[in-house]
């Protein structure tokens, strides 16, 4: 899987969208690596 910063940002945005934004406050692109997915 793509693990560049931009890929991580887009994947996280998709995850947030699917979860209705109900995730931990520190679950942001600069805090999570690709392995978080």
């Amino acid at each position: 899987a793509c693990d560049t910063a931009t890929c991580v940002t887009h994947r996280l945005a998709g995850l947030l969208s699917r979860s209705g934004g109900v995730v931990k406050n520190n679950f942001v692109p600069t805090n999570v690596g690709s392995k978080a997915f």
């Epitope: 793509c2 560049t4 940002t9 887009h10 692109p29 600069t30 805090n31």
Partner: antibody, heavy 119, light 107 residues
Framework: QVQLVQSGAEVVKPGASVKVSCKAS????????MNWVKQAPGQGLEWIGD????????HYNQKFKGRVTLTVDTSISTAYMELSRLRSDDTAVYYC????????????WGQGTLVTVSS | DIQLTQSPSFLSTSVGDRVTITCKAS??????VAWYRQKPGKSPKALIY???YRYSGVPSRFSGSGSGTEFTLTISSLQPEDFATYIC?????????FGQGTKLEIK
Amino acid sequence: QVQLVQSGAEVVKPGASVKVSCKASGYTFTDYYMNWVKQAPGQGLEWIGDVNPNNGGTHYNQKFKGRVTLTVDTSISTAYMELSRLRSDDTAVYYCASITIVPVYFDFWGQGTLVTVSS
Amino acid sequence: DIQLTQSPSFLSTSVGDRVTITCKASQNVGPNVAWYRQKPGKSPKALIYSASYRYSGVPSRFSGSGSGTEFTLTISSLQPEDFATYICQQYNYYPYTFGQGTKLEIK
């Protein structure tokens, strides 16, 4: 609203250094990566690198590695790009850009900073 | 580095026309391609991410498709503000790379 405001145009001599700033507002600066992109006159876009404002981590395009340094000052939500040993082919507009998710999911770019290398 | 080749480089067209721009990658980049519109003297404006998703506020006349090595941007009905340069970018691998651009000119 999200804004990236860059420092003004610079005229610098060959061999010198330049430091361009990019002040972010309207979002949490430390949450999103900041990219830097070069556009020489009449030319295409060239990615320089990115910086993680949360920990200062960087990725650099090998073409610029050794001459470029990307840093941040989180206390003033500002990213910096310093380019050293300037040559005439460094004359370009330099952009900062960041993809945010909150408050809006979008890819924002600064207005650009023209750096002219001339003796 | 991944090379992105756009075609055509120039396109002379008219308001209301349907336009398709192609971006070919030298290696498989999955769906990890973005498209930008740039007007002279202005910053690039993001249109599409992940090959086919429009950013918020981007008009529905813009659509993207493709995966792997071949991508397209389609503008279904050109508006006066669409005469500009369109640029693809891959972000699947470092360093990120851009296509050389496709300039749309008024016929």
